[in-house]
């Protein structure tokens, strides 16, 4: 995915008192945007 | 590789818990929003529940039909997230499915029945 | 919650031909910085699910641009421009804009 999913705040609005945001972030913090961003940690040697 | 591989999956009686363990390793897993999601035996798919990253507090999110009963948690040091399931109902019986919406993992099944 | 109905519920094509699926919501899909929260996924038999357009007409990483999105605010379109063999299984649409976030019932695609 070039912009993979958007999480952003579909949905702070169960809490009570708290906005509706209507915003969907998924994307920017999805799996494949990670990926993108973040270099994988060497995996550990034996 | 992306890999998220589901464990803990079995067959309970209702009223009883399990704890199901979504293991990830391929990608830098701290900011990365999660979720469970299942699929009931007539194919539909429910969201059930969802966590965010340290950065949004780990705030949680969940499905009317698991609320109060379902919890999610995730360990970053482990790159790992969990579904601990308790008061288990006959209708919980599904494949649960640990995801991030642009990879899944394979499934785990759990069965509720007496 | 916002209920997303899906049309038809299974279609038979032929290979080669083109074939759409429709997904309604009850509400409106388009969040703040004009983005649409709808988003289309395949099942595949015996496999899990795979994302394959996101916000409305974004194509998936390695999915082929036979798949196309499109919509309004609250009717969406999946096209399928040419069938191919492995494109059976079900399409579900889905929405993660408001929670608790819901997917449609899915449409089962099979070929003539």
């Known amino acids: 995915l070039a912009d993979p999913l958007d999480h952003r705040d579909a949905g702070d609005l169960w809490v009570p008192g708290e906005s509706e945001s209507f915003e969907d972030a998924h994307v920017e913090h999805s799996i494949s945007r990670s990926l993108l961003e973040g270099e994988i940690p060497f995996p550990p040697t034996s | 590789e992306v890999q998220l591989v589901e464990t803990g999956g079995s067959l309970v009686q209702p009223g009883k818990s399990l704890k199901l363990t979504c293991a990830t390793s391929?990608?830098?897993?701290?900011?990365?929003?999660m979720h469970w999601v299942r699929q009931s035996p007539e194919k539909q798919l429910e969201w059930i529940a969802h966590?965010?990253?340290?950065?949004?507090?780990?705030?949680?999110y969940y499905a009317e039909s698991v609320k109060g009963r379902f919890t999610i948690s995730r360990d970053d040091s482990k790159t790992s997230i969990y579904l601990q399931m308790n008061s288990l109902k006959d209708d919980d019986t599904a494949i649960y499915y640990c995801?991030?919406?642009?990879?899944w993992g394979q499934g785990v099944m759990v069965t509720v029945s007496s | 919650d916002t209920v997303l109905t899906q049309a038809p519920l299974s279609v038979s094509v032929t290979p080669g031909e083109s074939a759409s699926i429709s997904c309604r919501s009850n509400?409106?899909?388009?969040?703040?910085?004009?983005?649409?929260?709808l988003y289309w996924f395949l099942q595949k038999p015996g496999k899990s699910p795979q994302l394959l357009i996101y916000?409305?007409?974004n194509l998936a990483s390695g999915v082929p641009d036979r798949f196309s999105g499109s919509g309004s605010e609250t009717d969406f379109t999946l096209k399928i421009s040419e069938v191919e063999t492995e494109d059976v299984g079900v399409y579900y649409c889905?929405?993660?804009?408001?929670?608790?976030?819901?997917f449609g019932p899915g449409t089962k695609l099979e070929l003539q």
């Open positions: 995801t991030g919406l642009d990879y």
């Open positions: 391929g990608f830098p897993f701290s900011n990365v929003w």
């Open positions: 966590i965010k990253a340290k950065s949004d507090n780990y705030a949680t």
């Open positions: 509400k409106s899909l388009l969040g703040i910085r004009d983005i649409t929260s």
């Open positions: 916000r409305m007409s």
């Open positions: 889905a929405q993660f804009l408001r929670y608790p976030y819901t």
